[in-house]
């Protein structure tokens, strides 16, 4: 996160860290807890690393440096990448992770509400992006979970800023015209959440941007409301019945 500040314990209890253990262990992506056994993240996090066994999912944590070999983590039972996601394109950047064992909810580890299907009418004015990603383009992973308040940008405006890309209705953009605040490398898959009527909802999944926090280059997020049918289908068909935080 560029231009952000430290988060507090329990402030974003749905935020998880997706880490890979090969020879060393490192944080690669963020994710959002959406049910006892489900995490929503970005499909591109798994490019080149589709093997379930190498992943460790840490929930209920604030500081990555607190993680030791004894820190509990979740393992992956199943990775469900959107069927239309292609490595050669930037569309449908969404994936579900089914955890091997369900998580208990606590003050520091609980799910985020999902939006209603095709939610286009709600005007979100209080939106935040969180993650342990770089604090500048050529930076490094941060220890303490960062947060930043960023306004949503219309898709029309976003398309003007990204003429070489197709900004679809299944994407949502956020950023300041002058730049300075944005998600960055390592924040991928994490949440863009907005507070509406006193409740936090998962509006976007951190997907991509041209650099980080550049002027007139907003961050681009996968629009969760556009994938509600897919999320419900996959979580229900896998579970028999959904163990989801009900859509708002």
């Amino acid at each position: 996160i560029v231009g952000g500040t430290n988060s507090s314990w329990g402030e974003w209890p749905w935020q998880v860290s997706l880490q890979v253990k090969l020879t060393a262990q490192r944080h690669l992506c963020g994710g959002s807890l959406i049910g006892h056994q489900w995490v929503l993240t970005a499909a591109h996090c798994f490019d080149g690393l589709p093997l379930q066994d190498v992943w460790r999912i840490y929930s209920g944590i604030l500081n990555l440096s607190d993680i030791t070999k004894d820190t509990p983590f979740s393992q992956i039972k199943e990775i469900i990448i959107h069927q239309n996601y292609k490595v050669s394109e930037g569309n449908h950047d969404i994936a579900l992770i089914k955890l091997q064992a369900p998580l208990n909810y606590t003050e520091f580890q609980k799910p985020i509400c999902l939006p209603s299907k095709g939610d286009t009418s709600t005007i979100y004015t209080n939106c935040w992006v969180t993650g342990w990603g770089f604090s500048k383009e050529k930076g490094e992973i941060q220890n303490i979970l960062q947060k930043v308040n960023i306004p949503l940008v219309t898709n029309e405006e976003c398309q003007k800023r990204y003429q070489d890309y197709k900004i679809t209705q299944r994407m949502v953009c956020a950023g300041y015209k002058e730049g300075g605040k944005d998600a960055c490398k390592g924040d991928s898959g994490g949440p863009l959440v907005c507070k509406h009527n006193g409740m936090w909802r998962l509006v976007g999944i951190t997907s991509w941007g041209e650099g980080c926090a550049r002027r007139e280059q907003p961050g681009v997020y996968t629009k969760v409301a556009e994938y509600m049918d897919w999320i419900l289908e996959k979580t229900q068909s896998s579970d028999g019945k959904a163990q989801m935080q009900s859509p708002a």
Epitope: V87, Q163, W208
Partner: antibody
């Protein structure tokens, strides 16, 4: 199967014009940025131009700026290169290529993942 | 413009040997925008490596790419007969997009 097929090459006199076409199949053409690359006989590869998925944004190499025009017809899945005021140094095999633009570590990637077989343009009197 | 300088110009090696090809850029290039292509005589170029280190679909694991910033390397761990040809690095970080002049890998 993803395929690109160029046509329209041939022999043309200096100062003349030629229009190259590139027919795309096997993928959603309107989702992809497309590019032209050329290769003079016995030489290396030279990027010529690219066009955005909608066709609204184009960029050219200095060597062809003002003389060449890239365009596309998404309804026909076809890419074009209109070449005017041709010079001897434009003699080359012209390739069209699809520009893949995935995502890695929250940044876009960019690379030419599919190439046509090429069409030879010879500029000579 | 970003200049791409490949070395050596020609590499003469026997099958089974290791080939190391270098590509230097005149300015910082985001790794996501650095690719390597192989071209054999009379054929169109073929994508080998994208994002500086990711192998394209169908490319054998004897091909690997590394590097960051201004120094990039393509390595062929054990040369096979079909690997002989010319290799190009290319950047699309900034326009104009540019290619290196190529490294020719020939049979010793």
């Amino acid at each position: 199967e993803v395929q690109l097929l160029e046509s329209g090459g041939g022999l043309v006199q200096p100062g003349g014009s030629l229009r190259l076409s590139c027919a795309a199949s096997g993928f959603t053409f309107s989702h992809y940025l497309m590019t032209w690359v050329r290769q003079a006989p016995g030489k290396g590869l030279e990027w010529v131009s690219y066009i955005s998925p909608s066709g609204g944004h184009t960029i050219y190499a200095d060597s062809v700026k003002g003389r060449f025009t890239i365009s596309r017809d998404n309804s026909k899945n076809t890419l074009y290169l209109q070449m005017n005021s041709l010079r001897a140094e434009d003699t080359a095999v012209y390739y069209c290529a699809r520009v893949a633009r995935g995502i890695a570590a929250r940044s876009r990637t960019s690379y030419f993942d599919t190439w046509g077989q090429g069409t030879l343009v010879t500029v000579s009197s | 413009d970003i200049q791409m300088t490949q070395s050596p110009g020609t590499l003469s090696l026997s099958p089974g040997e290791r080939a190391t090809l270098s590509c230097r850029t005149s300015q910082f290039v985001n790794s996501n925008y650095l690719a390597w292509y192989q071209q054999t005589p009379g054929q169109a170029p073929r994508l080998l490596i994208y994002g500086a280190s990711s192998r394209a679909t169908g490319i054998p694991d004897r091909f690997s790419g590394t590097g960051y910033g201004t120094d990039f390397t393509l390595t062929i761990s054990r040369l096979e007969p079909e690997d002989y040809g010319t290799y190009y690095c290319q950047q699309s970080s900034r326009t104009p997009w540019t290619f290196g002049q190529g490294t020719r890998v020939e049979i010793k």
